[in-house]
């Protein structure tokens, strides 16, 4: 019987010879559980596992803790891959995180973190980041040191308010912090003075809601 090949991430898919962008089935580390992810096989050498994408407002990102844990949306469009998979994956080996952003004026920027991982669910999927480079701000728009993940039904932020309920979306809120890529999607000409929009403070400031975002990860030794 032919042994089925399984892939942990899009870097493994790429190295196996599949170099076309698209949706691939990945397997949880040390498990047979599977998950579908979009693989970017072209940007910056390819092998990128897309863990988040916003582009048109077609998917509601004001979701529960469980939904952010397991993932939601459509890998070919707007989606969240899932905190549990990303946590397990990024604790197996060292990963880099690239965040690609687009504004409504045709500009693009990115932030690249040379080391990224999420803690386990017991530690509220706290984000850990090191080594920022890129064009989307010299200071990290994800607060350092990293914060716990919060959702509308899981308030782990440092604000007297409830950031996820107020600003919408699950995110690593501080009080409430310089970013929220899972906020409300606002169309062009309605995207300024939006305090609950898609925010990356150190690129566009506090009230500007972005047009598109992609979060992608790849092994550091790719």
């Amino acid at each position: 019987k032919e042994e089925q090949i399984s892939f942990r991430d899009c870097a493994e898919v790429f190295k196996s010879g599949h170099t076309t962008n698209g949706i691939y089935t990945l397997t949880f580390p040390n498990s047979t559980e599977e998950i579908k992810a979009y693989c970017d096989m072209e940007a910056g050498g390819g092998g990128w596992t897309i863990i988040q994408r916003r582009e048109d407002g077609s998917v509601d990102f004001q979701r529960t803790w469980k939904e952010y844990k397991v993932g939601f949306g459509n890998p070919s469009g707007e989606y969240w891959l899932g905190n549990e998979f990303v946590s397990q994956l990024t604790n197996q080996q060292r990963y880099v995180l690239k965040i690609h952003l687009k504004d409504w004026e045709g500009n693009e920027a990115y932030s690249l973190y040379e080391h990224f991982y999420l803690s386990s669910e017991e530690l509220n999927y706290r984000i850990h980041l090191k080594g920022l480079t890129g064009t989307a701000g010299k200071i990290s728009s994800i607060s350092q040191p990293g914060n716990d993940f919060s959702t509308k039904d899981g308030d782990n932020d440092k604000c007297i308010c409830k950031c996820s309920q107020m600003l919408t979306g699950g995110w690593w809120f501080d009080a409430c912090g310089p970013s929220n890529l899972n906020g409300m999607y606002y169309p062009q000409r309605q995207n300024t003075n939006k305090f609950n929009g898609i925010k990356w403070y150190y690129w566009k400031g506090s009230g500007y809601s972005l047009k598109a975002t992609t979060m992608m990860i790849r092994p550091a030794d790719f």
């Epitope: 607060s143 009080a175 409430c176 912090g177 310089p178 305090f195 925010k199 150190y202 400031g205 506090s206």
Partner: nanobody
């Protein structure tokens, strides 16, 4: 610790007035623009007004222009919102917000306009 404490909300009849205050502490208040933002029942956040750090420039949402006035007293680390000619559609929780990287928020103050 950073704190923003809104006060001055309450129940008022249509056409009435209220003055909201926001007391700030724990950060350099006079270095940041400040805003008032509101959230009506079952709705998302709506920008109301912004004032620059020195107090010389202001902006207002069309829905409140001519009725609301934002001001600040940097010596007292306090932001204000004078609300006149109140309408039922002004009913909301009102938050002050600092244009700081953290985007600090308070708990809000409830304004209810009803006869």
């Amino acid at each position: 610790d950073v704190q923003l404490q809104e006060s001055g909300g309450g129940l008022v009849q249509p056409g009435g007035s209220l003055r909201l205050s926001c007391a700030a502490s724990g950060f350099t208040f006079n270095s940041y623009a400040m805003s008032w933002v509101r959230q009506a029942p079952g709705k998302g956040l709506e920008w109301v007004s912004t004032i620059n750090s020195g107090g010389g420039r202001t902006g207002y949402a069309d829905s409140v222009k001519g009725r609301f006035t934002i001001s600040r007293d940097n010596a007292k680390n306090t932001l204000y919102l004078q609300m006149n000619s109140l309408k039922p559609e002004d009913t909301a929780i009102y938050y002050c917000n600092a244009d700081h990287p953290q985007g600090y928020w308070g708990q809000g103050t409830q304004v209810t306009v009803s006869s």
